[in-house]
């Protein structure tokens, strides 16, 4: 399987909400011995390998924001910790998973990474990630709502296995 990022750039006005999205593509094993760990984190723009560094999102680590479930099951973070920070991560039946950030500030600008880890019990893990940039703007040229820029096909299906 691989991870696609439908949009590589989100440009939003401060105060707005945004939902960053990744999509799980390809055959997904739905066996009982397979679970998926999905999460989000910030990263610096690595010149060698994007998303190699894991930084918190609004002080919440990737462990705080994770979803853990089987196959294409739906899930979302309901814990108060994330919501108190204006964050919610979610996953649907179609392989889409997202993080919603509320009341954006200029501090939220940066590179965001989604991470999927396929965990096969008694076997190895398979990790893939996707990256996208969020620019929060202020002033007269800031859009009234978030504007999204599609990834190129090459970028949107960028596989990084670890």
């Amino acid at each position: 399987f691989k991870v696609a990022t439908p949009y590589s750039l989100y440009v939003c006005p401060e105060g707005q909400n945004v939902t960053l999205t990744c999509r799980l593509l390809g055959p997904v094993d739905k066996g009982h011995d397979v679970t998926f760990y999905k999460t989000w984190y910030r990263s610096s723009r690595g010149e060698v390998q994007t998303c190699s560094e894991r930084r918190p999102i609004r002080n919440l680590t990737f462990q705080d924001l994770h979803l853990h479930h089987g196959g294409h099951q739906a899930a979302n973070t309901s814990h108060d910790l994330a919501q108190r920070h204006g964050l919610e991560s979610a996953s649907d039946h179609h392989g889409n998973f997202s993080i919603t950030m509320r009341n954006l500030t200029l501090l939220d600008s940066g590179l965001y990474c989604c991470l999927v880890v396929e965990i096969r019990h008694h076997h190895s893990e398979h990790r893939v990630h996707g990256a996208m940039e969020l620019q929060v703007q202020t002033g007269k040229d800031a859009p009234s709502n978030c504007v999204v820029y599609p990834s190129s096909s090459q970028d949107s299906e960028n596989i990084t296995a670890a």
Partner: antibody
Framework: QSVEESGGRLVTPGTPLTLTCTAS????????MTWVRQAPGKGLEYIGI?????YTYYASWATGRFTISKTSTTVDLKIPSPTAEDAATYFC?????????????????WGPGTLVTVSS | DVVMTQTPASVSEPVGGTVTIKCQAS??????LAWYQQKPGQPPKLLIY???TLASGVPSRFEGSRSGTEFTLTISDLECADAATYYC??????????FGGGTEVVVK
């Protein structure tokens, strides 16, 4: 369009000081504004920014040492307890290039600066 | 914080010569970098933004470029009026709007 700083003077250590940046020819609700300082013979040092929406953000070293606020026509920089290290020329600048408010394009419109001297 | 390391601290070249100033970011900041020129007693003047875009009115003798996390300001066909201190400036994040240490350019 222009910006001009005022309020710089000689103060004794610990005496609160407020610097004011007055904007002319444009609206502060359209642009983020920033404060930068420069000690005599030294380089430029970023202090913080106030967004068009009125949110304030500070360089890590400046948090707690300065307060930025604004009205419809002015942006203030408050130095609650100046020390000798705070002696510098303080510049106010509009963020963005030319008429653009894009915060990634640098600081385009600068004031001439106002000098703060701290001495007992 | 992103640290901007600017070199050299000072450079001296004759009229008509070429000066190269480098700025190294401690981490990737994409192309979010600006260059300023400052003359004594004056505020800085924006020369280049987004690493390589010339501000209006700036002569094409000034050129900005990027290679990874290293940024370069090149001034060719030096003129006496180019004598000033030049600063790079990370514009990637409002927390990291940090400046380089500056480079004094002396035109002989």
């Amino acid at each position: 369009q222009s910006v001009e700083e005022s309020g710089g003077r000689l103060v004794t250590p610990g005496t609160p000081l407020t610097l004011t940046c007055t904007a002319s020819g444009f609206s502060l609700s359209d642009y983020a504004m920033t404060w930068v300082r420069q000690a005599p013979g030294k380089g430029l040092e970023y202090i913080g920014i106030i967004s068009a929406g009125g949110y304030t953000y500070y360089a890590s070293w400046a948090t707690g040492r300065f307060t930025i606020s604004k009205t419809s026509t002015t942006v203030d920089l408050k130095i609650p307890s100046p020390t000798a290290e705070d002696a510098a020329t303080y510049f106010c600048a509009r963020v963005g290039y030319a008429d653009s408010s894009d915060i990634y394009k640098g600081f385009y419109l600068w004031g001439p600066g106002t000098l703060v001297t701290v001495s007992s | 914080d992103v640290v901007m390391t600017q070199t050299p601290a000072s450079v001296s070249e004759p009229v008509g010569g070429t000066v190269t100033i480098k700025c190294q970011a401690s981490e990737s900041i994409s192309n979010y970098l600006a260059w300023y020129q400052q003359k004594p007693g004056q505020p800085p003047k924006l020369l280049i933004y987004l690493a390589s875009t010339l501000a209006s009115g700036v002569p094409s003798r000034f050129e900005g470029s990027r290679s990874g996390t290293e940024f370069t300001l090149t001034i060719s066909d030096l003129e006496c009026a180019d004598a000033a201190t030049y600063y790079c400036h990370c514009t990637d994040s409002i927390i990291n709007y940090n400046f380089g240490g500056g480079t004094e350019v002396v035109v002989k």
